[in-house]
């Protein structure tokens, strides 16, 4: 004998309590295959998840992540903080580092450029949103006959590249 429930198409369920008639899945639920006796609960894309595809009677909702996060795991099971270098994550998503700060990673916050003058050094390479300044030896260190007791020349403030 054929199971009468096998006639129930996707989007319906076979009602255990009503002579195995096919009934449509209720709102916020679905059945992706025929012959099911229960409908599955639709996934809800909340918090850092956002809806990529709405739930239908035959397929589950699909989620992706809000800006600043990327999907991890099968079916975007989790969202991971993820910005570009030169950015930091804020409540409104990824934002470029402010002038004078940098972030050389795809997570974390923007940090101030190193102040070369605090170490008595000069700026060898200007800083960017993605990279810290590179400090070089002070001008006095580069002059001929300089000794260790020579007082350092006044250091320049860190330079920068246009943002």
């Amino acid at each position: 004998l054929q199971d009468p429930c096998s006639n129930c198409p996707a989007g319906t369920f076979c009602d255990n309590n009503r002579n195995q008639i096919c009934s449509p899945c209720p709102p916020n639920s679905f059945s992706s295959a025929g012959g099911q006796r229960t409908c599955d609960i639709c996934r809800q894309c909340k918090g850092v998840f956002r809806t990529r595809k709405e739930c239908s009677s035959t397929s589950n909702a699909e989620c992706d992540c809000v800006p600043g996060f990327r999907c991890l795991g099968a079916g975007c099971a989790m969202c991971e903080e993820y910005c570009q270098q030169g950015q930091e994550l804020t409540q409104k998503g990824c934002k470029d580092c402010c002038f004078g700060t940098f972030n050389d990673q795809k997570r974390g916050i923007c940090r101030p450029w190193t102040n070369c003058s605090l170490d008595g050094k000069s700026v060898l390479v200007n800083g960017t949103k993605e990279r810290d300044v590179v400090c070089g030896p002070s001008p006095a260190d580069l002059s001929p006959g300089a000794s260790s007791v020579t007082p350092p020349a006044p250091a320049r403030e860190p330079g920068h590249s246009p943002q």
């Epitope: 009602d15 916020n28 639920s29 229960t38 609960i41 809800q44």
Partner: antibody, heavy 122, light 112 residues
């Protein structure tokens, strides 16, 4: 139609524990099944449910702490991944009868198993 | 997540009397009706009394009556018997894939 839990015992904190729910007279593919617990002196607490097709749904506090799985058409498991003393409770398994014919879990939990006691202590 | 607030415990009444237990939900349950009532005695599993707010479960005496809709629900036990002494819980069904069900805190009924 009946439900029975097993596997409850004394465990030390952090030691995973798997509880088993064995049903008779019906198939797990035909109904939603739920796990509920009651800690000493406390009320009933919903842990999670599994649909007839095997999809699982958890209370927000239980996500990551518990795993519900189906091992056969008549056997359901609840794994407590890393028990703490707060997980000491009687654990119940119940079928959602869906007597109103909604086609999904409705809260008409019946029948229930007698429960199995889990004690987490060092 | 939704919260179900039940009548403070304990509620007491004499044999033959009537008790009314309320269950107030912070959000409407699915279909305004998916709320169940359970009786729980020490050492026993919960017993389904009412489903879908007002439907009497199989084998439950008609002395138990459920009513209400949306966010406000009531369980009334009339012609109280000593065997009715127990803690009663409501549980609501919500449109969520996480906190799909929420239990109330329970109400103890004392029969004098």
């Amino acid at each position: 139609q009946s439900v029975e839990e097993s596997g409850g015992r004394l465990v030390t904190p952090g030691t995973p524990l798997t509880l088993t729910c064995t049903v008779s007279g019906f198939s797990l593919s035909d109904y939603y099944m739920t796990w509920v617990r009651q800690a000493p002196g406390k009320g009933l607490e919903y842990i999670g449910i599994m649909s007839g097709s095997g999809s699982t749904y958890y209370a927000s506090w239980a996500k990551g702490r518990f795993t519900i799985s189906k091992t056969s058409s008549t056997t359901l498991e609840l794994k407590i991944t890393s028990p703490t003393t707060e997980d000491t409770a009687i654990y119940f398994c119940a079928r959602d009868g869906d007597y109103a014919g909604w086609g999904y879990a409705t809260g008409a939990f019946d029948p229930w198993g007698p429960g199995t006691l889990v004690t987490v202590s060092s | 997540a939704a919260v179900l607030t039940q009548t403070p415990s304990p509620v007491s009444a004499a044999v033959g009397g009537t008790v009314t237990i309320s269950c107030q939900a912070s959000q409407s349950v699915v279909g305004n009706s998916l709320l169940s009532w359970f009786q729980k005695k020490p050492g026993q599993p919960p017993k389904l009394l009412i489903y879908s707010a007002s439907s009497l479960a199989s084998g439950v005496p008609s002395r138990f009556k459920g009513s209400g809709s949306g966010t406000q629900f009531t369980l009334t036990i009339s012609d109280l018997e000593s065997d009715d002494a127990a803690t009663y819980y409501c549980t609501g069904r919500y449109n969520s894939d996480t906190d799909t069900f929420v239990f109330g805190g329970g109400t103890e009924v004392v029969v004098k």
